[in-house]
């Protein structure tokens, strides 16, 4: 844990936007917050008939849904868009749908990159 | 929390002006703090943040080189150095605590005007 | 980062349901406050991280969204909401305020 709001947690960076946005593609994001917030990685994603459509990765300001989560796990039954956060260096690495209704987890490995930092 | 910004005043368009920021009620040395104006009628505008060691510093574009902000921990306050002043920068400036401006400042008037 | 918001200018009554949006150029996560201005005074934070009620703001005022799209939401406007609103994205530099929402009296 740092000093003051420049505690740093790092994320794993993903727009699927990326050219209309004009940003990065992907890579690493440096998280920066205020002293008495916390901070999180998160994850969204789209699941058209069971292929899996990333459209964004990175930082997640204080929120409390978000506390003492090790591992990124969307909850909603069945959303247009998945969500999930959580707390820890790259913690969003790797995400999972496990609906709080029950139904089969699902969990996501990502393929294999080289990623580049943004700060 | 509080933040009393001083050093605003009327002067002419190419001139400097020293706005000052002192804050009490927390610890001063644990935070960024920020710099923040509104035109008259105007909507409000960032103008610049330090960080709580003085070791970044960023600004809107339009002062870029022109305004400078910097902080004396041991005496809680920021400062805004402000040269070559132009009509635009006519408005009030606020100090702001933190960079997500949780508490504000009451504000200081600067004027420029031949 | 480009903010814009949605009205610029509205007239409600007191009792009434208010929403305003502002949406950002790109995608800011949830790297978004919301201010409130009357006339005169200073402006107050209500809402930081998008959705987080600032310390001793009333439970009327929420705020939702994420990405691009944000609203500050008023659920029973009271006569000391009249104002004008303001968003600020603070994900990249230079930070910028939506244009701001003058909330009148109908």
């Known amino acids: 844990s740092g000093r003051g709001e420049a505690e740093t947690r790092e994320c794993i960076y993903y727009n699927a936007n990326w050219e209309l946005e004009r940003t990065n593609q992907s890579g690493l994001e440096r998280c920066e917050g205020e002293q008495d917030k916390r901070l999180h990685c998160y994850a969204s994603w789209r699941n058209s008939s069971g292929t899996i459509e990333l459209v964004k990765k990175g930082c997640w300001l204080d929120d409390f849904n978000c506390y003492d989560r090790q591992e990124c796990v969307a909850t909603e039954e069945n959303p247009q868009v998945y969500f999930c956060c959580c707390e820890g260096n790259f913690c969003n690495e790797r995400f999972t749908h496990l609906p709080e209704a029950g139904g089969p987890e699902v969990t996501y490995e990502p393929p294999p990159t080289a990623p580049t930092l943004l700060t | 929390v509080q933040l009393v910004e001083s050093g605003g005043g009327l002067v002419q368009p190419g001139r400097s002006l020293r706005l000052s920021c002192a804050a009490s009620g927390f610890t001063f040395d644990s935070y960024w703090m920020s710099w923040v104006r509104q035109a008259p009628g105007k909507g409000l505008e960032w103008v610049a943040n330090?960080?709580?060691?003085?070791?970044?510093?960023h600004y809107m574009d339009s002062v870029k080189g022109r305004f400078t902000i910097s902080r004396d921990n041991a005496k809680n306050s920021v400062y805004l150095q402000m040269n070559s002043l132009r009509a635009e920068d006519t408005a009030v400036y606020y100090c702001?605590?933190?960079?997500?401006?949780?508490?504000w400042g009451q504000g200081t008037q600067v004027t420029v005007s031949s | 980062i480009q903010m814009t918001q949605s009205p610029s200018a509205m007239s409600a009554s007191v009792g009434d349901r208010v929403t305003i949006t502002c949406r950002a150029s790109q995608g800011i996560s949830n790297y978004l406050a919301w201010f409130q201005q009357k006339p005169g005074k200073v402006p107050k934070r209500l809402i930081y991280a998008a959705s987080s009620l600032q310390s001793g703001v009333p439970s009327r005022f929420s705020g939702s969204g994420s990405g691009t799209g944000f609203t500050l939401t008023i659920t029973s406007l009271q006569p000391e909401d009249f104002a004008t609103y303001y968003c600020?994205?603070?994900?990249?530099?230079?930070?910028?305020f939506g244009q701001g929402t003058k909330l009148e009296i109908k």
């Open positions: 702001a605590k933190g960079a997500w401006l949780d508490y």
């Open positions: 600020l994205q603070h994900k990249s530099y230079p930070y910028t």
């Open positions: 330090i960080k709580y060691d003085g070791s970044e510093k």
